[in-house]
């Protein structure tokens, strides 16, 4: 590794990768091993970030970028740049401080992580429930009563259906 | 665990030089820098200088360019301060500390207890 | 060289209280300071670097701040263990220098 000074700041001709080392007379120096500068003219590399425990490597650290950690299966990334690990729950579940728990009727979670949201009130928008919701789902809205006099049709029909093989024109 | 053992004291006479040790463990002695610093009862802290194991490389303040010398011996990872000519401004506590090479900050992550050190006849 | 001032060195305070000590470079140090807590018994140990960053093993009651020339050591829920003497030391060029100490007595 080519070790350089320059005539002006010394530090400033320090690429990405190295150091300017105070103490060698302000050269610049390649980052000791698990340590990384990813912008020019630093006195100090940076500790990579070590993913240990809950958290797996997604990117491995190298002299110009800092390692990126995801979690291990069961659990899912917090905050920026996964600072944290939450657990998984099913759908249909809320992580407490007990652990998993099934969502209170009423409400659903549709998804491994986050809180159970209540269902959607259908009659604040006029409307009325077509399909109930679960733990998993939320409720279906479908037309207001109003709207289902008789001979209407509350399902929207099918759009015609295309021959395998075909294309549009 | 890091430590840096040092001695608990040391007299010395006048003229008479003397040499502090700072022997480590815990760690890979040859990756971090070894510091030396002067504490003088009820004052502050001067850096002395400090040598990188590996390969013997040192620095100094100029303020104590002619009263120290750093060395180190790899095979007892023990770090070495020669103090020349001795008066009675050279009476305080010397420590050892390290810090590793190229990052942190430069700053000293873990520090000996101290050699006191006292000048008289 | 250098230098490193701290204005302040000694401060009463009671357990519980919020404690801010300075330091101040004669000239910007990029944020290369260091602060050092020294017990009565001499043990010296590392508290922060690199104005912010914690070191391993240090509670989160002791934090750093500040920039260019000026910096301070934040202790926000004072404990008796805390009473000790607090260096700050600059890292950006040799050579290495520190505040003169702020000494942290308890009411």
């Known amino acids: 590794f080519e070790r350089t000074r320059s005539l002006q700041d010394p530090c400033s001709n320090c690429p990405a990768g190295t150091f300017c080392d105070n103490n060698r007379n302000q050269i610049c120096s390649p980052c000791p091993p698990n340590s990384f500068s990813s912008a020019g003219g630093q006195r100090t590399c940076d500790i990579c970030r070590q993913c240990k425990g809950v958290f797996r490597t997604r990117k491995e650290c190298s002299s110009t970028s800092n390692a990126e950690c995801d979690c291990t299966p069961g659990f899912h990334c917090l905050g920026a740049g996964c600072s944290m690990c939450e657990q998984d729950c099913k759908q249909g579940q809320e992580l407490t401080k007990k652990g998993c728990k099934d969502c209170c009727f009423g409400t659903f979670n549709d998804q491994k992580r986050g809180i159970c949201r209540p269902w959607t009130n259908c009659s604040l928008d006029g409307k009325s429930v077509l399909v109930n919701g679960t733990k998993e789902r939320d409720v279906v809205c479908g037309p207001s009563p109003a709207d289902l006099s008789p001979g209407a049709s509350s399902v929207t029909p099918p759009a015609p259906a295309r021959e395998p093989g075909h294309s549009p024109q | 665990q890091v430590q840096l053992q040092q001695p608990g004291a040391e007299l010395v006479r006048p003229g008479a030089s003397v040499k502090l040790s700072c022997k480590a463990s815990g760690y890979t002695f040859t990756s971090y820098w070894i510091n030396w610093v002067k504490q003088r009862p009820g004052q502050g802290l001067e850096w002395i200088g400090n040598i990188y194991p590996s390969d013997s490389y040192t620095n100094y303040n100029q303020k104590f360019k002619d009263k120290a010398t750093l060395t180190v011996d790899k095979s007892s990872s023990t770090a070495y301060m020669q103090l020349s000519s001795p008066t009675s401004e050279d009476s305080a506590v010397y420590l050892c500390?390290?810090?590793?090479?190229?990052?942190?900050?430069?700053?000293?992550?873990?520090w000996g207890q101290g050699t006191s050190v006292t000048v008289s006849s | 060289d250098i230098q490193m001032t701290q204005t302040t060195s000694s401060l009463s305070a009671s357990l519980g209280d919020r404690v801010t000590i300075s330091c101040r470079a004669s000239q910007d140090i990029s944020n290369y300071l260091n602060w050092y807590q020294q017990k009565p018994d001499g043990t010296v140990k590392l508290l922060i670097y690199?104005?912010?960053r914690l070191h391993s093993g240090v509670p989160s009651r002791f934090s750093g701040s500040g920039s260019g020339t000026d910096y301070s050591l934040t202790i926000s829920n004072l404990e008796q263990e805390d009473i000790a003497t607090y260096f700050c030391q600059q890292g950006y060029t040799l050579p290495y220098t520190f505040g003169g100490g702020t000494k942290l007595e308890i009411k």
């Open positions: 690199y104005t912010s």
């Open positions: 500390t390290r810090f590793p090479d190229g990052y942190y900050s430069y700053a000293m992550d873990y």
